[in-house]
């Protein structure tokens, strides 16, 4: 008999190399039977995982599996790091493996000044 537990299918030590300035969708594959669980994303800060409150998320439903998506519009240098999705199901908390984003900053400091530098340059 197939298990009706919620399962989160993020592979152990999964990673994504992405460019800052472009959009990206981070997917958490979720398998459930009847009622879709409440799923959240968090970002690892040391040993604690900080819940991402003000970020855009959505569901994508497919035949055998659903995906809870964290949207980056666009990716920022600060988005570099490890993320985890968690599901609340029948009072149980199920946590995924962490997945790591490696963000490359295409607009490197050598290529263009930051807005703060522009402002200080204006007043100099």
């Amino acid at each position: 008999k197939e298990s009706c537990d919620v399962q989160l299918y993020i592979k152990r030590q999964s990673e994504h190399s992405i460019l800052a300035g472009d959009p990206f969708e981070l997917e958490c594959p979720v398998k459930y039977c009847a009622n879709r669980p409440h799923v959240t994303w968090c970002k690892l800060n040391g040993t604690t995982c900080v819940k991402l409150e003000d970020r855009q998320t959505s569901w994508k439903e497919e035949k055998n599996i659903s995906f809870f998506i964290l949207h980056f519009e666009p990716v920022l240098p600060n988005d570099n790091g490890s993320y985890r999705c968690s599901a609340n199901f029948q009072s149980n908390l199920i946590e995924s493996h962490s997945t790591t984003l490696y963000v490359t900053d295409v607009e490197s400091a050598s290529e263009r000044p930051s807005k703060d530098e522009m402002a200080s340059r204006f007043w100099a």
């Epitope: 460019l19 800052a20 300035g21 472009d22 959009p23 409150e53 003000d54 970020r55 855009q56 949207h71 519009e73 666009p74 920022l76 240098p77 600060n78 295409v106 607009e107 290529e111 930051s114 807005k115 703060d116």
Partner: antibody, heavy 120, light 106 residues
Framework: QVQLKESGPGLVAPSQSLSITCTVS????????VHWVRQSPGKGLEWLGV???????SYNPAPMSRLSISKDNSKSQVFLKMNSLQTDDTAMYYC??????????????WGQGTSVTVSS | QIVLSQSPAILSASPGEKVTMTCRAS?????MHWYQQKPGSSPKPWIY???NLASGVPARFSGSGSGTSYSLTISRMEAEDAATYYC?????????FGGGTKLEIK
């Protein structure tokens, strides 16, 4: 220096389509996103969509079905096409550059806008 | 979509007076941008990410807030500050603007 300039038809008949070109200089479309924002007396400022540096697009879900944004990197041009125009699409249409810092994203340079009137 | 409500819609201030306008979001946002627009001109970036002044913006301007409540303050009103100010959120698509606060000089 960074510049964006919109060119459009000015007057469009109801139910017809609108095409606006945004020609940019001082930056590359492969590095920065370009947004379309319109401003009408009735609706105020409304973000329509963006052409991201890598060629993907994001749209405002409300007018999304009528919108199409494309670009030509070599000509430094971004194109907005909107179908089935109605009188409430009358507005000033702006193209705007998007830029990011370490932890935020914003629209920093705006074109002067092109005025579009939908009328028969 | 996140609705941004600006208040007051119209604000009249005397030179030298302290001015505060607010922007309330229907849902929590990470930060708020502010743009200044004068008649016949395009909007100009004024405050980035809640509190960072854009290039060329006088130091009498400041921004603050978090969650659903944000504000723009002018410590001492000057004639050149008369304009319409729009708040703008980049947290959730569609990326929305407030209806604007028109600041007039008395």
């Amino acid at each position: 220096q960074v510049q964006l300039k919109e060119s459009g038809p000015g007057l469009v008949a109801p139910s017809q389509s609108l095409s606006i070109t945004c020609t940019v200089s001082g930056f590359s479309l492969t590095t920065y996103g370009v947004h379309w924002v319109r401003q009408s007396p009735g609706k105020g400022l409304e973000w329509l969509g963006v052409m991201w540096p890598g060629g993907r697009t994001s749209y405002n879900p409300a007018p999304m079905s009528r919108l199409s944004i494309s670009k030509d990197n070599s000509k430094s041009q971004v194109f907005l096409k909107m179908n089935s125009l109605q009188t409430d699409d009358t507005a000033m249409y702006y193209c705007v550059r998007g830029d990011y810092e370490y932890d935020y994203y914003a629209m920093d340079y705006w074109g002067q806008g092109t005025s579009v009137t939908v009328s028969s | 979509q996140i609705v941004l409500s600006q208040s007051p819609a119209i604000l009249s201030a005397s030179p030298g007076e302290k001015v505060t306008m607010t922007c309330r979001a229907s849902s929590s946002v990470s930060y708020m941008h502010w743009y200044q627009q004068k008649p016949g001109s395009s909007p100009k970036p004024w405050i980035y990410a809640t509190s960072n002044l854009a290039s060329g913006v006088p130091a009498r301007f400041s921004g603050s807030g978090s969650g659903t409540s944000y504000s723009l303050t002018i410590s001492r009103m000057e004639a050149e500050d008369a304009a319409t100010y729009y708040c703008h959120q980049w947290s959730s698509n569609p990326y929305t603007f407030g209806g604007g606060t028109k600041l007039e000089i008395k």
